[in-house]
Interface confidence: medium
């Protein structure tokens, strides 16, 4: 018996330890979202048993204080789904001492009538005006730089209409440096992690996408004002196409936004001579007057593989040459205005009808294959490059019916140390719960251990590879005390063990010869410290008569004394 | 029109280590493997191993495992070879071929690694 | 390793004649043969690939058959430009192997 999966949270996502008693599930949100709820649930033991608390959900804040802003974003209530009225909200954001701010626009979507978006260049609500959504109808493709370390966010609807509201990305940046650049439905590259001058950015878009606008390669300029040199491209769906990749998507223009009306877009798509292509057709929801048509061969005259309009849930086709025409033509009249409408069609090369469809490689990573040909219990295997882990899963197998046995995995950029683990005898200090960059662990000794190794490690990013600990995890050893150094006998005396060194804790036992009579403590201790030291001075044996005392004295006069006077174990 | 010229002849003393280029043109290089296939003095064809272009993943005849090291860089359109610690057994002119995972379509001319003190 | 025997090493023949390559692989392949041709001091030529797939370029009188452990190459009608030597390569596991080669030469 256990609880059931947790559900994940829209904007978020979670982790389970197990399902079964004891188990936990932790929760975490998107950047711009945030945790309502309790981050971190426990299976409890029962009949049926059943997670402690409710799951928590992921929302999109009506304001807050951003401090020590590096990289995020901030979303207006209900994105991408849309605001409600009535709002005023207010952020501040805050780089760290020393920095500036960037905000890329990713996108702004305001009711044409009272709703407002005002960023201002300071910490307040009279800060003058960077961006008024009032003043200004197009979105500056370049972003707005802050002249300090603050931008102040206003979002104002009211009491009509809405729309999807806006979410801004924001980034820090130093003195001498430029400002990460962002390019929405892509990806870069870059020469630098901190983009200095002469750093240069490579963009690329992901699948389905194509660059346009602004350049490919951009460099950063000008040692006494950085900037870079071009306007960052833009990724975009775009209505028509000719592909000749083993392996892509095709996607409804301007996906994930909903596509135009009066649109007729035609893909063509072409593999090698003798193979076939598989369409895994993932999201289709188009209206009820538009169409999308599958012509199997390389035009409109070709057979019709399959012709769909409205909703539809995820299925495949097959084609039986080596090009496909994809033809969508939406209604003039009408158009489907959601977020997510139109299509997502995935397609692959399948080189004969006894092996599973070619598997792309996947940016960040390579695949191996069990053996060359894809036939039925081949398995291919994905790995990341250093830095880069493996989201999904890494191993895919052809199944008796030519598809594979899980969905194509991607390489994710690896930014936080992995769990140093506890060290036996020491409790743990935590500076953030998912060892991102920049985290310290610290261990404490539990008492009577003393550590070994480095007590503070700190999460560093490395250039090539993962994300690394400063140093290995310490160890706390039992606290080892120095000995104390024998003491000799009393003259006329024994003394009880007669060894050189005496561990700490260990007890010694004094005794006098017949006729003397033992003056001071007959046990003494070696007290543990550092250094561990004897707890008394040593005995004497005094004579038990007179004559033998006088005589005894005279003695001790004559000699030297004694040099076991000396207490610490040190000497 | 796919074309792959390979690197210039080779002499080298036993021990010695050589690193022998591919560069491509004529087709996307990125989305491609290149092979790389041994052939002695009147002997048969032995498969080294490819390289996939694009994601720089590689596959290796056990056999050469150690002796022969893939490499590609993109913005060149380069694949190479680097065979190391060479005996006279390593004497053979080394084909690069594009292809798929599975057969060879366009063959370089050869580089011939002569092994000799 | 799968193994891929070639008959005869060498063949004698005239041209005009046709011609039949022999390729044994050492288990069951399906149909995961590619044949090859090496004229003298050249690189290898794809000629068929999947036992029977033509490669577009490749003159008509090339064919391909067989599939499980044995494959034959034909050529119908022989030309004095076929004289070369001929080899069968496997894709069904790894490593990719050769055989050793056929050797064509006119009578």
């Known amino acids: 018996l256990s609880c059931h999966f947790p559900r994940r949270p829209a904007y978020g996502d979670v982790t389970v330890t197990s399902l079964h008693p004891g188990g936990s599930a932790r929760f975490h949100c998107a950047t711009g979202y945030q945790l309502k709820g309790a981050r971190h649930l426990t299976c409890l033991n029962a009949t049926q048993p059943f997670w402690d608390s409710k799951e928590p959900v992921c929302i999109a804040a009506c304001g807050g204080v951003i401090r020590n802003a590096t990289t995020g974003r901030i979303v207006s209530p209900g994105f991408p789904g849309n605001y409600s009225n009535n709002l005023t909200c207010h952020w501040l954001l805050e780089a760290p001492e020393g920095q500036r701010l960037h905000l890329h626009f990713e996108k702004v979507s305001l009711a044409e009538d009272d709703d407002r978006l005002i960023i201002r260049n300071g910490d307040n609500v009279e800060a003058p005006p960077v961006y008024d959504s009032y003043e200004v109808e197009y979105l500056p493709i370049e972003g707005l730089l802050s002249s300090g370390k603050h931008f102040f966010v206003e979002l104002s609807t009211d009491s009509s209409g809405a729309a999807a509201g806006m979410a801004l990305r924001y980034e820090a940046f130093q003195q001498g440096h430029c400002y990460e650049p962002f390019v929405k439905y892509g990806n870069f590259s870059s020469s630098t992690p901190t983009y200095p001058v002469g750093t240069t950015v490579e963009f690329s878009c992901d699948p389905g996408y194509t660059l346009e606008q602004g350049s490919i390669i951009i460099e950063c300029v000008d040692p006494h004002d950085p900037q870079w040199n071009e306007t960052e491209p833009a990724c975009r769906a775009v209505c028509s196409g000719e592909i000749t990749d083993s392996a892509g998507v095709v996607l409804s223009p301007n996906w994930p936004e909903p596509y135009g009306r009066g649109q007729d877009c035609i893909w063509g798509v072409h593999v090698e001579e003798d193979k076939r292509i598989m369409l895994d057709i993932r999201v289709l929801r188009i209206g009820p007057g538009d169409v999308l048509t599958f012509y199997d061969g390389d035009d409109l005259t070709a057979r019709v593989l399959g012709q769909y309009s409205g909703p539809r849930s995820h299925f495949k086709l097959f084609t039986s040459m080596a090009d496909v025409t994809i033809q969508f033509q939406s209604d003039p009249g009408t158009s489907v205005l959601g977020y997510q409408q139109g299509f997502v069609i995935h397609f692959f090369e399948v080189p004969r009808n006894d092996t599973c469809p070619e598997l792309p490689e996947i940016p960040n990573g390579w695949k191996s294959p069990s053996q060359p040909e894809l036939v039925h219990g081949t398995v291919v295997t994905y790995q990341c490059y250093p830095g880069y882990q493996v989201v999904g899963s890494s191993v895919l197998m052809c199944q008796w019916d030519l598809t594979w046995s899980e969905d194509l995995p991607s390489c994710q950029r690896v930014t936080s140390c992995h769990d140093p683990g506890d060290v036996e005898h020491s409790r743990r200090l935590i500076s953030s719960p998912k060892f991102p960059v920049g985290a310290t662990v610290q261990y404490i000794c539990d008492q009577g251990f003393v550590l070994m190794g480095s007590s503070i490690l700190t999460c560093h990013d490395r250039q090539a590879g993962s994300p690394k600990w400063s140093d290995r995890a310490p160890k706390c050893l039992l606290e080892q005390l120095k000995p104390c150094h024998g003491l000799s006998a009393p003259e006329n005396g024994a003394r009880s063990p007669e060894k050189q060194l005496h561990p700490a804790g260990a007890t010694i036992h004094f005794s006098c010869a017949p006729g003397y009579v033992l003056k001071g403590q007959a046990s003494i201790k070696c007290v543990p410290g550092h250094p561990s030291h004897w707890s008394d001075p040593p005995p004497i044996c005094r004579a038990a008569s007179l004559d033998g005392f006088y005589n005894s004295r005279s003695l001790d006069v004559a000699k030297a004394p004694a040099a076991s006077s000396t207490l610490d174990a040190a000497h | 029109q796919v074309h792959l010229p390979q690197s210039r002849p080779e002499l080298v003393k036993p021990g010695a280590s050589v690193k022998i280029s591919c560069k491509a043109s004529g087709y996307g290089f990125t989305r491609s493997y290149i092979h790389w296939v041994k052939q002695r003095p009147g002997q048969g064809l032995e498969w080294i191993g490819y390289?996939?272009?694009?994601?720089?993943?590689?596959t290796y005849n056990q056999k050469f495992k150690g002796k022969a090291s893939l490499t590609a860089d993109n913005p060149s359109s380069t694949a190479y070879m680097h065979l190391s610690s060479l005996t006279s057994e390593d004497s053979a002119i080394y084909f690069c071929a594009r292809g798929g995972v599975r057969y060879f379509d366009v063959w370089g001319a050869g580089t011939t690694v002569t092994v000799s003190s | 390793d799968i193994l891929l025997t070639q008959s005869p090493a060498i063949l004698s023949v005239s041209p005009g004649e046709g011609v039949s390559f022999s390729c044994r692989a050492s288990?069951?392949?399906?149909?995961?043969i590619h044949w090859y041709q090496q004229r003298t001091n050249g690189s290898p030529r794809l000629l068929i690939k999947?036992?029977?797939e033509s490669i577009s370029g490749i003159p008509s009188r090339f064919s391909g058959s067989g599939s499980g452990t044995d494959f034959t190459l034909r050529i119908n009608s022989l030309e004095s430009e076929d004289i070369a030597d001929y080899y069968c390569?496997?894709?069904?596991?790894?490593?990719?192997?050769f055989g050793a080669g056929t050797k064509l030469e006119l009578k």
């Open positions: 999947y036992a029977s």
């Open positions: 390289i996939s272009s694009g994601s720089g993943g590689t």
């Open positions: 288990q069951s392949i399906g149909t995961s």
């Open positions: 390569q496997q894709s069904n596991s790894w490593p990719l192997t």
